[in-house]
């Protein structure tokens, strides 16, 4: 019962986690940036993995996809890759874990097969969660480094001036969604791996017992007949099993043998 609950909970937690990873990957608010020239023409920027958006104080919002932009930061491509790998692994893990669920019967699937599938999906969820956490963390690190790197003022040869505006890039909502989702997927994966141990059929450690076929001697007597089984009180046919010191288990573990005469 506990195994089924652990497996089911692991599946649900991972499902929520993967849904969160997909949501984070699609979100535009990976980084946000405030730029205030004045209260009227205030501009609010936010960037995602796929497009960059600007929202003005008037309410006007415009988004541009990165396909129009050459030379995307390599880190951005790496983050995209990590998130996609996380989603793909998570999706496959979900598919596998559906068939591995103890509460779902598919044909004559053995518990050992379900245990293996549970372990496989658990590992997939763990890797998926780690990919998401890594992707989000790489992005967060990129924001922090880029902010500290650009500070100097520059001058153009045209007589005009170019200077860096101390605009602050802050972590967008998608980063927090990604971290939480990655963590949930990871936890779900661990739960699946724990459930796998309970699902695996335990090999019973039977003590080796040698069964000796006892001689069947039947004595005919005028008062009827008696079947001796070798375990009876018939001293003539009694076999003595002398195995030395016996454990409690051994004493009561001999199977009863029925002779039908």
């Amino acid at each position: 019962m506990a195994v089924t609950a652990c497996q089911g909970l692991g599946f649900v937690v991972s499902l929520i986690g993967i849904a969160g990873i997909i949501a984070a990957t699609c979100m535009d608010q990976w980084s946000t940036q405030d730029l205030y020239n004045n209260p009227v023409t205030a501009v609010f920027n936010y960037q995602g993995l796929w497009r960059s958006c600007v929202r003005e104080s008037s309410g006007f919002t415009e988004c541009r996809g990165y396909f129009t932009l050459l030379g995307l930061p390599a880190m951005l491509q790496a983050v995209r890759a990590l998130m996609i790998v996380g989603i793909v692994l998570g999706a496959i893990g979900l598919l596998v874990s559906i068939f591995a669920l103890k509460c779902i019967r598919i044909g004559s699937m053995e518990d050992s097969a379900k245990a293996n599938m549970t372990l496989t999906s658990g590992i997939m969820f763990i890797v998926s969660g780690l990919c998401a956490i890594a992707g989000v963390s790489v992005f967060a690190n990129m924001l922090v480094t880029n902010f500290w790197m650009s500070t100097a003022n520059m001058y153009t040869g045209m007589g005009g001036m170019v200077q860096t505006v101390q605009t602050r890039y802050t972590f967008g909502a998608a980063l927090f969604v990604g971290w939480v989702a990655g963590g949930l997927t990871l936890i779900g994966g661990v739960m699946m791996c724990i459930a796998c141990r309970g699902l695996a059929p335990e090999e019973t450690n039977y003590k080796a017992v040698s069964y000796h076929a006892s001689g069947h001697s039947v004595a005919y007597k005028p008062g009827g007949f008696k079947a001796s089984t070798g375990f009876g009180s018939n001293t003539k046919n009694k076999k003595i099993y002398d195995g030395g010191a016996r454990t409690e288990d051994e004493v009561q573990s001999y199977p009863s043998k029925h002779d039908y005469v």
Epitope: N37, V40, T41, S52, F60, S150, Q163, T164, V165
Partner: nanobody
Framework: AVQLVESGGGLVQAGGSLRLSCVAS????????MGWYRQTPGKQRELVAD????????YYVDSVKGRFTISRDNAKNTVYLQMINLKPEDTAAYYC???????????????WGQGTLVTVSS
Amino acid sequence: AVQLVESGGGLVQAGGSLRLSCVASGSWFRIQTMGWYRQTPGKQRELVADITTGGGSTYYVDSVKGRFTISRDNAKNTVYLQMINLKPEDTAAYYCQANVLEALFRPNLEVWGQGTLVTVSS
């Protein structure tokens, strides 16, 4: 790099009009806002008007409201300042300024033109 080039300044009589133009050239991801600042000798540079390149929200300093109009042509990467009913106190060097998102996940650049002189004679 982004460069701004202003034009349209000159000498004009009080009550007259002028139209300043500012063209942005170079490479960038998005120009956020473009505006006009002015500076008179011994004084600090002050914002006259600015406009967002996306939605076209505008801002004017009180002293020019009703007399100056800022507009933009995104296709030409140009911002205009139409000035009518000019006063002698409008005499100044007018600078074009653009707030540019040059590359992703980088701080914005504040790009300035070299300035154009507007002289209003009484």
